[in-house]
């Protein structure tokens, strides 16, 4: 038997993946648990095996179809259950009526590349991955640049309040190594959150021309 409080949080990547984390205060020794997804309007249902990510939390990804296939709509509700094996039976440990487009977390942006670099500025572009057709242009981005001697946490956030998959970084120092990250968020959804940060893109500004002030 399991006692204690539990928390069951899931996000939809807007296409064909629901990622879930289940936290449980009480001890769970050698218990097999899974998440079961049952949509109210669709013909499929799906399960994934919960795997430990810490002493009291488990995670899994419900793969609903091919990565770019649109498996849910803005009108769908998915009943999500945490089921744990108790002897020969499955016990429902947590349940929620999940509205996918109210609980969005997109995939991190991909394909970051330097379009053009100068001594003091750098133009960078990226692409969004597995984003639904529903969003049209209703996305926003945050970006950050890692300067030498600083941490990511210290980097100021640059906000792009529209679907703009490029940025021109200004007032950079010549001949300096930088790293850049970006993340994306749909404007839709009460519980929607930012995507993970992209993989960092390393770039170096051009050296200042000899004999010129910088």
């Amino acid at each position: 038997a399991v006692n204690g409080t539990s928390q069951f949080t899931c996000f939809y990547n807007s296409r064909a993946n629901i990622s879930c984390v289940w936290s449980q205060d009480g001890a769970l020794q050698d218990t097999s648990c899974q998440v079961h997804a049952w949509p109210d309007r669709r013909r499929w249902n799906q399960t994934c095996e919960l795997l430990p990510v810490s002493q009291a939390s488990w995670a899994c990804n419900l793969i609903l179809g091919a990565p770019d296939s649109q498996k849910l709509t803005t009108v769908d509700i998915v009943t999500l259950r945490v089921l744990c094996r108790e002897g020969v039976r499955w016990r429902v440990m947590a349940i929620q009526d999940f509205k996918p487009f109210e609980n969005l977390r997109l995939m991190a942006p991909i394909s970051l590349q330097v379009v053009h670099v100068e001594t003091h500025r750098c133009n960078i572009s990226w692409e969004i991955s597995q984003a639904s057709h529903y969003f049209e242009r209703h996305l926003e981005f945050e970006a950050r640049t890692l300067s030498p001697g600083h941490t990511w946490e210290e980097a100021p956030l640059l906000t792009l309040k529209q679907k703009q998959e490029w940025i021109c970084l200004e007032t950079l120092t010549p001949d300096t190594q930088y790293e850049f990250q970006v993340r994306v968020k749909p404007l839709q959804g009460e519980f929607t959150t930012w995507s993970p940060w992209s993989q960092p893109l390393a770039f170096r500004t051009k050296p200042a021309a000899l004999g010129k002030d910088t």
Partner: antibody, heavy 116, light 107 residues
Framework: QVQLVQSGAEVKKPGASVKVSCKAS????????ITWVRQAPGQRLEWMGD????????NYNEKFQGRVTITVDTSASTAYMELSSLRSEDTAVYYC?????????WGQGTLVTVSS | DIQMTQSPSSLSASVGDRVTITCRAS??????LNWYQQKPGKAPKLLIY???GLHSGVPSRFSGSGSGTDFTLTISSLQPEDFATYYC?????????FGQGTKLEIK
């Protein structure tokens, strides 16, 4: 087997209301949306709204401007569609259907005639 | 609302023919497109769901394809019982909407 059986034909005067029933059998009534679709003579099918019997949640086509009300009686596995302030252009066959990735089972239809 | 437009509106064909009906949505509906067959005085019957899924009991001569805004229903070899009116329907968003229908007649 899954069956949806609708109430019989109705003749109504303009301004009146009509309530059509749809009795479901052969599946768990509370687990699937019931939708209502109508078809005026020679016209395309027109979605009116739907209801999830397990929760009572409803969605309506704004075209009907609050004239349509969809309800269920789960104890009788029956859905209802009421259309008020009837006008002649509401003369149509009204269908209920179960939604499961498309409308996979349909009632036989109920002809509603609005005439003075 | 999403407008659904079918073409042609009517079509004459013979038993054994291969027939294609197209459906165009006024905006991207991904794969949330269903096809129905209706005969006079009867309720529609679901043929294809989610663009290409064959509903149970529907003969394999019916197939669907497409994505985004353009979709097709194909009947590979017409049978006498296939002469009817066919409708496409989007369930991408409320209000769900139907095409105007394609009447398939015997040549």
């Amino acid at each position: 087997q899954v069956q949806l059986v609708q109430s019989g034909a109705e003749v109504k005067k303009p301004g009146a209301s009509v309530k059509v029933s749809c009795k479901a059998s052969g599946y768990t009534f509370t687990s699937h949306w019931i939708t209502w679709v109508r078809q005026a003579p020679g016209q395309r099918l027109e979605w009116m709204g739907d209801i999830y019997p397990g929760s009572g949640n409803t969605n309506y086509n704004e075209k009907f401007q609050g004239r349509v009300t969809i309800t269920v009686d789960t104890s009788a596995s029956t859905a209802y569609m009421e259309l008020s302030s009837l006008r002649s252009e509401d003369t149509a066959v009204y269908y209920c259907a179960r939604e499961r990735g498309g409308f996979d089972y349909w009632g036989q239809g109920t002809l509603v005639t609005v005439s003075s | 609302d999403i407008q659904m437009t079918q073409s042609p509106s009517s079509l004459s064909a013979s038993v054994g023919d291969r027939v294609t009906i197209t459906c165009r949505a006024s905006q991207d509906i991904s794969n949330f497109l269903n096809w129905y067959q209706q005969k006079p005085g009867k309720a529609p019957k679901l043929l294809i769901y989610y663009t290409s899924g064959l509903h149970s009991g529907v003969p394999s001569r019916f197939s669907g394809s497409g994505s985004g805004t353009d979709f097709t229903l194909t009947i590979s070899s017409l049978q006498p019982e296939d002469f009817a009116t066919y409708y496409c329907q989007q369930d991408n968003n409320h209000p769900y909407t139907f095409g105007q229908g394609t009447k398939l007649e015997i040549k």
